[in-house]
């Protein structure tokens, strides 16, 4: 299996944005790569977003995706937005080297993303 590295812990910003790097040790010269972010919480795994990209090109997520990203060599910079406290969980980076064959699959150990909802502003008396 291909090795995938990602940070153990990331704290989302007060605006609910979390960014982390997903790095893979490519055993071959892939031209087409698929990156998938999975969220594991309470032993349930769900797909957060996925993108396929050509090496050297930008990642293209679906228009309604909460993810954006850029790639550089064997590194993918992933940003997840719109996070709330309830989205706290383990976010796993899955990398697939699709073409040319052979196919390689690597799954990271996950990044624990902590999301803290901002305190509401107290009402002002005028």
């Amino acid at each position: 299996a291909m090795h995938v590295a990602q940070p153990a812990v990331v704290l989302a910003s007060s605006r609910g944005i979390a960014s982390f790097v997903c790095e893979y040790a490519s055993p071959g010269k892939a031209t087409e790569v698929r990156v998938t972010v999975l969220r594991q919480a309470d032993s349930q795994v769900t797909e957060v977003c996925a993108a396929t990209y050509m090496m050297g090109n930008e990642l293209t997520f679906l228009d309604d995706s909460i993810c954006t990203g850029t790639s550089s060599g064997n590194q993918v910079n992933l940003t997840i937005q719109g996070l709330r406290a309830m989205d706290t969980g383990l976010y796993i980076c899955k990398v697939e080297l699709m073409y040319p064959p052979p196919y390689y699959l690597g799954i990271g150990n996950g990044t624990q993303i902590y999301v803290i909802d901002p305190e509401p502003c107290p009402d002002s008396d005028f």
């Epitope: 031209t31 087409e32 396929t52 050509m54 699709m98 073409y99 040319p100 064959p101 052979p102 196919y103």
Partner: antibody, heavy 118, light 107 residues
Framework: EVQLVESGGGLVKPGGSLRLSCAAS????????MAWVRQAPGKGLEWVSF????????YYADTETGRFTISRDNAKNSLYLQMNSLRAEDTAVYYC???????????WGQGTTVTVSS | DIQMTQSPSSLSASVGDRVTITCRAS??????LNWYQQKPGKVPKLLIY???RLHSGVPSRFSGSGSGTDFTLTISSLQPEDVATYYC?????????FGGGTKVEIK
């Protein structure tokens, strides 16, 4: 039900051109790579070309590189093979096939016959 | 290119017989070995992928085995409807290549 229907074959003179089409239905076309495979009369199967689901990756057999062009239109659920500079040895039944992992062709069309002869 | 060599090129067996077809790759293809069946005058159909996994709708009398460079397709009990040419195909490296085929007939 997965369905692949090829069209565009016919008789063409050496050096001529043809454009094959493959209409796909019964599955999400944009999720799958697609391939063309041919079979000369009385012979075995020969892989011709492949295009990935989003058309990022395109590959050809050595003998077809520069003469054949594979393309797809995901909005129309269609696959194409533009064949130029055709030779007698290109005479075959051309099959369009769906190709998922593990680089296997899991569903095939009924084929369209290409005959290159003067 | 990876060469795929099938043997025998043809065979004749009786209904109920166990039939074995072998496929040898010119180099290690890991588990990227697929088998196809083509009945006379018909379209090829995927039988087995990843060496041993049956494609949907394929009868359980078909099985695949092997590793590395040597692979086998077995029909445990030959049926009249199994008359066909069987092809192996490697997906490990481009160009994808097929074996020359094994024609199976009923005695």
């Amino acid at each position: 039900e997965v369905q692949l229907v090829e069209s565009g074959g016919g008789l063409v003179k050496p050096g001529g051109s043809l454009r094959l089409s493959c209409a796909a239905s019964g599955f999400t076309f944009s999720d799958y790579g697609m391939a063309w495979v041919r079979q000369a009369p009385g012979k075995g199967l020969e892989w011709v070309s492949f295009i990935s689901n989003l058309a990022y990756s395109v590959y050809y057999a050595d003998t077809e590189t520069g003469r054949f062009t594979i393309s797809r239109d995901n909005a129309k659920n269609s696959l194409y093979l533009q064949m130029n500079s055709l030779r007698a040895e290109d005479t075959a039944v051309y099959y369009c096939a769906r190709s998922g992992l593990p680089y296997a062709m899991d569903y095939w069309g009924q084929g369209t016959t290409v005959t290159v002869s003067s | 290119d990876i060469q795929m060599t099938q043997s025998p090129s043809s065979l004749s067996a009786s209904v109920g017989d166990r039939v074995t077809i072998t496929c040898r790759a010119s180099q290690d293809i890991s588990n990227y070995l697929n088998w196809y069946q083509q009945k006379p005058g018909k379209v090829p159909k995927l039988l087995i992928y990843y060496i041993s996994r049956l494609h949907s709708g394929v009868p359980s009398r078909f099985s695949g085995s092997g590793s590395g460079t040597d692979f086998t397709l077995t029909i445990s009990s030959l049926q009249p409807e199994d008359v066909a040419t069987y092809y192996c195909q490697q997906g490990r490296m481009l160009p994808w290549t097929f074996g020359g085929g094994t024609k199976v007939e009923i005695k």
